[in-house]
Structure formats: structure tokens, C-alpha cells
């Protein structure tokens, strides 16, 4: 007897693991036997190459590789979300629709919420190393490593809770370098290494001794970039200092550094970084094109010694390591307006003094360039005829022009009434799209 379709097996939410295909199951009853079709975010799948989906005779959907992300239905979606799949089973008596199954891809971000910090603990007392792992899907698990090996957790002495490692009673053997490792199916991330020093219970003479320490900061030298760090590394300096006073009571040294402000201006706050050395050490994470003040402070447990003298170093400017963003071309009255947004601040590599704008050859503008000085982020170019106008923009520091933006083009039509800049929701024309259009 004929009957309308009914979904017997609904597709399930799943994680695309790769490299093998993902499978979405769907089984339906009905007479005559229903035909199965699949939808992604409500849109039917074509199943025609290069579509990565393939339908098996039993209605199972094979996904050979992750689909390109469609339009998100939940605002600013996470990069983990690949979409919602539903299957439809149809015969002449009707159609049944399955529940939606969400396909996602594993993600593990790089930035730890809380990094473990160097610390000094006392024998017999408890201490905690905090760790907040990066965001991940699926949620990452946290494990702890000591001196490059997984930490053997001892019940009653070690507890890992919410990422943090609680040590019930510190022993001398707990001294070492600890690292928190976040792991999920996308991979793993390692925190910074935290140095844990264990000391015997102290009498109170040490801080007094520490006050007698004198530190002379002798040298601050700009280090040559390590080629292994890629073409645009952040600057680092080498600090060298001499210690005099009692017999080396300091257990660690901290660099204090800040950007120098204009004379008479309020000083920027000092940033602090624990140094991995007792007479010299590297200090990274600085910015090109800044004047810095540096000093060194000794410490022992919670006690701090007096700061060293201050040394100054000017880091040279470099060319910007990223192009201006959001470059747009808009038609005006006999002109074309070029506008842009500065490169991200972390890529300035100095003070941006202006911008270089180029027109590209083989278009209606002859090859030319313009210089825009100061903070202005737009330029008006006179146009004399219809045709295509293509430009690139680069930010300029004292070291020169940085990386140029991708070419952006504008097609001014004959009557100049209508200017085409955005082909069907795909953003500004690229040179390649423009050439393809002109060929057509």
C-alpha cells in the first residue's frame, strides 16, 4: 500500500576530521520508495563536480572535503561552522524533512587566556600554576609538562582544575620549567614556559641583603633578526648588566621598559618582562620606530631590589609590513575618489607619514603615482574619459613605502552615469576580474 515518506534515520551533528570523507546518513520509509535530496543551509546541493558532495544509493551523503562557508545565519559566525545539512525524502504522496545536522570543523586558536607565570614557592607550602587555554572547538583539554616531559600527576599532591595545576606540598624536586599544553582534534598549542623555583623556608635577612644589591645596566643592543622568524620579525634587544653587592642574593632579574614620551610629557607605564639570564638576556616584543627606555630590577621571591640605571635606545623605522586596508574607488564628477584605511597598528613599524598611490598601466590612466602626506586616507584623481581605472596604495614610514594593496579597479562607462565597482556582492573588482570582464 502506498504511504508518504517518513524519516527513519536523521543526520547527526558531526565534526569534519579529514583527510577521509565525512558521512551524513539519512534513511526514509515510504511507498513508492522516496527519493532523497540534500540541502545545505536550506539550499539544494547540486552534486555536480566541482561540488564536493556525493550521494550514495542508500541516501548517505559523502562530503569529500569541507564546503566553502556559506552565509552565516548567526551573525558574526565562528570559523568552525560549515553549515546545517537537512535531507528531504519525497514521493508522489509528499515530502518529509529531516532534522538539521550541523557540520563543523575543528579549530584551536593560538592565544592563551592565562599564561603560567614564573614563580618562587616554599618547600611544604602549596602553589598554583594558572593556565587558561585558547578557544577551541571541540573544547581543548589541558595537560602539564615539566622540563619537556609530560608531568606525572600524583593523586593527593597534584590537581588539575579548570586548566590550572595545584601542587599541594612543594618539594625541591618540583623545581623546573612548566608548560601548559592545550589539545583538541585540530592540534595542540603550548603555553610559555614558566620557571618554578623552590626554596627552603626563609629567615628575613634576604630582603635586607637584596636592598644592598647594585645593578649597572651596561649595554642595550639591537639584535639582528633571526631569518627563521620569517621576513618581518619583531625587534629584540640584548641587555647586559653587572651586579655588585652581597653574594648574588637575587634569584631573578626583570627588564622594565617603556616608550619614551616627549620631554615634559607624562611617562608611559613601565612594562615588565622576566629575563632568562643573570648577567645578560634577550628582550623581545618591541616595536620598530620607537624610542625606548630600559632598566633592570633584581628580585628574590616577593622581595625586590633597587632598579638599575636607565639606558635609551632608538629602534629604527622599517617599512610597513602590511598594506592599507579596505581600498575603494568611487566615481565623482569628472574624478575618481580613492579611499583606504591604514594598515593594522601592529604592522606600522614606525610612524606612518603618508601614502603612495599608483595607477597601473594598460588602463585609462597612464602609469603614475601620487604622494598623500600625513594622516589623510583619501585622494581625488581627475578623469578625462570612460574606461577602467586601477590603483594600488602603500603606507609610507621614514624607511620608505611598504607592501602595496591588491590592485582595485573601477569601470567608468561611456556616459559616466553608472560606474561598476561591485560585481554581484563580491566586493571591489580585482585586476583579474576586470580583465575577464573586458575580454567578454
Amino acid at each position: 500500500q502506498d504511504s508518504p515518506p517518513q524519516i527513519l534515520v536523521h543526520p547527526q551533528d558531526q565534526l569534519f576530521q579529514g583527510p577521509g570523507p565525512a558521512r551524513m546518513s539519512c534513511q526514509a520509509s515510504g511507498q513508492p520508495p522516496p527519493t532523497i535530496r540534500w540541502l545545505l543551509n536550506g539550499q539544494p546541493l547540486s552534486m555536480v563536480p566541482p561540488d564536493p558532495h556525493h550521494l550514495l544509493p542508500d541516501g548517505t551523503l559523502l562530503l569529500l572535503q569541507p564546503p566553502a562557508r556559506g552565509h552565516a545565519h548567526d551573525g558574526q559566525a565562528l570559523s568552525t561552522d560549515l553549515g546545517v545539512y537537512t535531507c528531504e525524502a519525497s514521493n508522489r504522496l509528499g515530502t518529509a524533512v529531516s532534522r538539521g545536522a550541523r557540520l563543523s570543523v575543528a579549530v584551536l586558536r593560538e592565544d592563551f587566556q592565562i599564561q603560567p607565570r614564573d614563580m618562587v614557592a616554599v618547600v611544604g607550602e602549596q602553589f598554583t600554576l594558572e593556565c587558561g587555554p585558547p578557544w577551541g572547538h571541540p573544547e581543548p583539554t589541558v595537560s602539564w609538562w615539566k622540563d619537556g616531559k609530560p608531568l606525572a600527576l600524583q593523586p593527593g599532591r597534584h590537581t588539575v582544575s579548570g586548566g590550572s595545576l595545584l601542587m599541594a606540598r612543594a618539594e625541591k624536586s618540583d623545581e623546573g620549567t612548566y608548560m601548559c599544553v592545550a589539545t583538541n582534534s585540530a592540534g595542540h598549542r603550548e603555553s610559555r614556559a614558566a620557571r618554578v623555583s623552590i626554596q627552603e623556608p626563609q629567615d628575613y635577612t634576604e630582603p635586607v641583603e637584596l636592598l644592598a644589591v647594585r645593578i649597572q645596566l651596561e649595554n642595550v643592543t639591537l639584535l639582528n633578526p633571526d631569518p627563521a622568524e620569517g621576513p618581518k620579525p619583531r625587534p629584540a634587544v640584548w641587555l647586559s648588566w653587572k651586579v655588585s653587592g652581597p653574594a648574588a642574593p637575587a634569584q631573578s632579574y626583570t627588564a622594565l621598559f617603556r616608550t619614551q614620551t616627549a620631554p615634559g610629557g607624562q611617562g608611559a607605564p613601565w612594562a615588565e618582562e622576566l629575563l632568562a639570564g643573570w648577567q645578560s638576556a634577550e628582550l623581545g616584543g618591541l616595536h620598530w620606530g620607537q624610542d625606548y627606555e630600559f632598566k633592570v630590577r633584581p628580585s628574590s621571591g616577593r622581595a625586590r631590589g633597587p632598579d638599575s640605571n636607565v639606558l635609551l635606545l632608538r629602534l629604527p623605522e622599517k617599512v610597513p609590513s602590511a598594506p592599507p586596508q579596505e581600498v575603494t574607488l568611487k566615481p565623482g564628477n569628472g574624478t575618481v575618489f580613492v579611499s583606504w584605511v591604514p594598515p593594522p597598528a601592529e604592522n606600522h613599524n614606525g610612524i606612518i607619514r603618508g601614502y603612495q598611490v599608483w595607477s597601473l598601466g594598460n588602463t585609462s590612466l597612464p602609469p603614475a603615482n601620487w604622494t598623500v602626506v600625513g594622516e589623510q586616507t583619501q585622494l581625488e584623481i581627475a578623469t578625462h574619459m570612460p574606461g577602467s581605472y586601477c590603483v594600488q596604495v602603500a603606507a609610507v614610514t621614514g624607511a620608505g613605502a611598504g607592501e602595496p594593496s591588491r590592485p582595485v579597479c573601477l569601470l567608468l562607462e561611456q556616459a559616466m552615469e553608472r560606474a561598476t565597482q561591485e560585481p554581484s556582492e563580491h566586493g571591489p573588482w580585482t585586476l583579474e576580474q576586470l580583465r575577464a570582464t573586458l575580454k567578454r
Epitope: G132, P138, E139, G163
Partner: antibody
Framework: EVQLVESGGGLVQPGGSLRLSCAAS????????MSWVRQAPGKRLEWVAT????????YYPDSVKGRFTISRDNAKNTLYLQMNSLRAEDTAVYYC???????????WGQGTLVTVSS | DIVMTQSPLSLPVTLGEPASISCRSS???????????LNWYLQKPGQSPQLLIY???NRFSGVPDRFSGSGSGTDFTLKISRVEAEDVGVYYC?????????FGPGTKVDIK
């Protein structure tokens, strides 16, 4: 459409407890970290708590650590804030907000008022 | 904890004119990976805060392009190229680089 609706606010005596809820809809709740932020009358916004997408990792400022507990039920698409040992300075409008990774709070609820007074 | 300061705390503006708000942190907001998590929010009278700019200079979807963010390290700026009537409210910066996350005191923008 992303929607966050807080409830559970009200008047409570100092030392008392209150549990706030935030019902989420319009997005896959279980893949987003979530936060609570509060605003005392006429004051700046103050971050109160954050919980990871799976609920394992929680973060608090010192001002509420040990007194407030953030939790979530991914099956019910609901975020909670259990507030114990309440003080007058906890009086505020409490907002729940969705996090993109741990980068920024993109959508906020309309808020629920908590008043701590004898 | 990171202390966030904003200036000015009050900003009377003329419609159609530009406006600029500064936000400073007591420590660099750039983390060891070179990422800076500084966001800007607008709280209109009687409403919840709404996101304008994330990670220093990225405009959130639906935010008009008259809003732009810039800065690095400890100094950040929100600019409105041409103020419109709907832009009135309190603007807050928020850093989420370091736990605890901290907001600035807010800058109240109103029309002259």
C-alpha cells in the same frame, strides 16, 4: 537572529544569594564562549565572568572570585550566574554577552537589574 | 590589573563634524603572539552596549564606515568622520588581552 534574554534579577539582602539565567537562541550556543558584564548605576561597565564553550574553563575578576560562579547548560542553551554573599556594591544591571572566540563580545542581552539592599 | 583611561570623558560635538576619542592602557595590550585585543562599544541611552570596533581597527558588521579605530601598544583612538544624531551615547573601550578584562570609564558624546 541572535537573541540573549536575561532573567532572575531582583531585590536581595546583603549576604543573600541570587541566580541569573540567560536564554540564548538564534545561534549554536555550544560553540561560543559566553560572559557576564555588569553596570552599576551611573558607572562604567565591569566584566564579571567568562565561561568557555564547553564549560570547563571559567574566568573571574578578583572582585567576585569565590562568590560568583558562571555555568552553562548547552542542552538547554542557557547561561547562568550564581551569586552568593552579595554586597551592596554588587547592585547593577547584569548583561550576558556572546563571545567570538575570546576576542570580543558581539551580542548583548537587554540586562536584568540586581539590587542588594537591606 | 590593566587600568584603562579615556579622554575626553565628555565630548560635545556638532552634527556633520568629526570626533575623536582616546583610550590608554596602563600596560601594552599586545600579547606574545603580536595580537592586540582592544574593542570599542557604544551604549546608547537606555540600551545595552553594541559592538563598533574589534581588535583595534576592524569594523563590526553593520557598523557605518564613518567609525574607524586605530592604535597600538598602549594608545588607541576611535574616530567618527562625520557625527550623526544617532551616534550620541557613551563610548567604552575594552581590553581582553589580559585577564581580568577591563573597560575604560566611558566617553559621553552629545550634540552641542
Amino acid at each position: 537572529e541572535v537573541q540573549l534574554v536575561e532573567s532572575g534579577g531582583g531585590l536581595v539582602q546583603p549576604g543573600g544569594s541570587l541566580r541569573l539565567s540567560c536564554a540564548a537562541s538564534g545561534f549554536t550556543f555550544s560553540t561560543y564562549a559566553m560572559s557576564w558584564v555588569r553596570q552599576a548605576p551611573g558607572k562604567r561597565l565591569e566584566w564579571v565572568a567568562t565561561i568557555s564553550n564547553g564549560g570547563t574553563y571559567t574566568y573571574y575578576p578578583d572582585s567576585v572570585k569565590g562568590r560568583f560562579t558562571i555555568s552553562r547548560d548547552n542542552a538547554k542553551n542557557t547561561l547562568y550566574l550564581q551569586m552568593n554573599s552579595l554586597r551592596a556594591e554588587d547592585t547593577a544591571v547584569y548583561y550576558c554577552a556572546r563571545l567570538i572566540y575570546y576576542d570580543y563580545l558581539d551580542y548583548w542581552g537587554q540586562g536584568t537589574l540586581v539590587t542588594v539592599s537591606s | 590589573d590593566i587600568v584603562m583611561t579615556q579622554s575626553p570623558l565628555s565630548l560635545p560635538v556638532t552634527l556633520g563634524e568629526p570626533a575623536s576619542i582616546s583610550c590608554r592602557s596602563s600596560q601594552s595590550l599586545e600579547n606574545s603572539n603580536g595580537n592586540t585585543y582592544l574593542n570599542w562599544y557604544l551604549q546608547k541611552p537606555g540600551q545595552s552596549p553594541q559592538l563598533l570596533i574589534y581588535r583595534v581597527s576592524n569594523r563590526f558588521s553593520g557598523v557605518p564606515d564613518r567609525f574607524s579605530g586605530s592604535g597600538s601598544g598602549t594608545d588607541f583612538t576611535l574616530k567618527i568622520s562625520r557625527v550623526e544624531a544617532e551616534d550620541v551615547g557613551v563610548y567604552y573601550c575594552l581590553q581582553v588581552t589580559h585577564v581580568p578584562w577591563t573597560f575604560g570609564p566611558g566617553t559621553k558624546v552629545d550634540i552641542k
